[in-house]
């Protein structure tokens, strides 16, 4: 794993414990909470990051929790079960034996049930819409410059291949970033759009997951782009299965 050899840290995941106990004394990093080895040359899976987040003591949190983001979905925080590859297991249960099915980004896609609930497969989230509203500026950003800047960011910071950024829409002050990645498109080694979206979400909230890298400083031709609210919508390859009672509520 390409962790920084000199001081043995994980550049892409600060929620790790690293030591030079890999083959040949190489630096090896393990995710907090799960103890799973992570590849520090790429993004860590969202499942392992959520598990690490839940394992961190509440009073010794290393990440900032900004107060100005009123739309943080704290209900979405749970201690997930991850498979040996670090992906979400299709069925998640809490300590009171309440279970539900999730998609590949760990978002619930069925009604809650008991231990008899079956989740046959992990359904892939193939389309993510990141909806942002930026703080007021003197004028609108140039659409092409904004578009290019966000595409550059996903390439450089999150290592997401440019083919997976489908579109960037802008109607001041709303910015929408569309990420698309079908199962057939995702090659070995490609960053998952769900992981990239999660890192971006945490960056926007001032809770960067990167080690020893400055926080996100988004600028368009030198003009700061400050986000004041974020909503993320997930579309699955197979539609979710909720009861009509929930849908009409």
């Amino acid at each position: 794993h390409t962790a920084a050899q000199d001081n043995c840290t994980c550049p892409t995941n600060k929620m790790t414990v690293c030591s030079p106990d890999g083959p040949g004394g190489r630096c090896q990093c393990r995710a907090l909470g799960s103890g799973m080895a992570v590849d520090c040359s790429t993004l860590t899976s969202k499942c392992l990051l959520l598990k690490a987040r839940m394992s961190a003591p509440k009073n010794a949190r290393t990440l900032v929790r900004p107060s100005e983001h009123a739309l943080v979905d704290n209900d979405g925080l749970y201690d997930p079960d991850c498979d040996p590859e670090g992906r979400f297991k299709a069925r998640q249960c809490n300590q009171t034996s309440v279970c539900w099915c999730v998609n590949s980004v760990g978002v619930r896609r069925t009604d809650k049930g008991d231990l008899s609930l079956r989740c046959d497969e992990l359904v892939r989230t193939h389309h993510i819409l990141i909806d942002l509203r930026h703080r007021p500026t003197a004028g609108a950003f140039n659409h092409s410059d904004l578009d290019a800047e966000l595409r550059r960011l996903f390439r450089e910071r999150y290592r997401l291949h440019p083919k997976f950024v489908a579109a960037v829409h802008y109607e001041q002050p709303t910015i929408q970033i569309e990420l698309r990645q079908n199962t057939s498109q995702k090659a070995a080694g490609d960053v998952d759009i769900g992981d990239a979206a999660y890192y971006f979400e945490r960056d926007i909230k001032g809770e960067s997951l990167f080690q020893g890298r400055g926080g996100l400083d988004l600028r368009v031709r030198g003009e700061p782009l400050q986000v004041e609210r974020t909503l993320i919508y997930y579309l699955d390859e197979i539609p979710p299965k909720f009861s009509m009672k929930r849908l009409t509520a």
Partner: antibody
Framework: EVQLVQSGPEVKKPGASVKVSCKAS????????IGWVRQAPGQGLEWIGE????????YYTEKFKGRVTMTADTSTSTAYMELSSLRSEDTAVYYC??????????WGQGTLVTVSS | DIQLTQSPSSLSASVGDRVTITCRAS?????MYWYQQKPGKAPKLLIY???TLASGVPSRFSGSGSGTDFTLTISSLQPEDFATYYC?????????FGQGTKLEIK
Amino acid sequence: EVQLVQSGPEVKKPGASVKVSCKASGFTFTDYVIGWVRQAPGQGLEWIGEIYLGSGTIYYTEKFKGRVTMTADTSTSTAYMELSSLRSEDTAVYYCARGSIFPFDYWGQGTLVTVSS
Amino acid sequence: DIQLTQSPSSLSASVGDRVTITCRASSSVSYMYWYQQKPGKAPKLLIYDTSTLASGVPSRFSGSGSGTDFTLTISSLQPEDFATYYCQQWSSYPYTFGQGTKLEIK
């Protein structure tokens, strides 16, 4: 095999325009980015800008904005860079380079553009 | 714009020598990239993500650094290594290159 093949050398008069082509093969053209870099004789590398081939999104550096136009023809997998209002200091080798999760992973062979009266 | 300053600008060395080229950024960057260019040829990607060798690059090349200070090291110079080396960043637009370091035979 990934290849970027550029058009041949050009000699232009000051004030004229030049259009350099970059024909790609060996990869899915619209999945990538083509960046343009120039190198004046005996000098270093200077980035001009880039075009996202799938969306047509373009970013030009401030220095070249207004004088450069980047386009792509997806039917022939060819990217183009046109520079107008040429002056003698635009004499350089112009390179196209493919971008992915790296800024430039494969480069064209370069096109020498000479601006002389 | 982020300025990259390479040192030295030129360097004379012999086959078998250990050579280090430094690249200093005017503000912090995430990663540094290094390219090798031989006369009349296009640049070739040598090192990406500060320290990872590009495909086919010999292990005598290595890269290190973080923040604003980065280095390219050639542990034992070979005849084919005499070329010009450039560092480059893309942590922010516009992408910028160092002015280059010309490595010549002593």
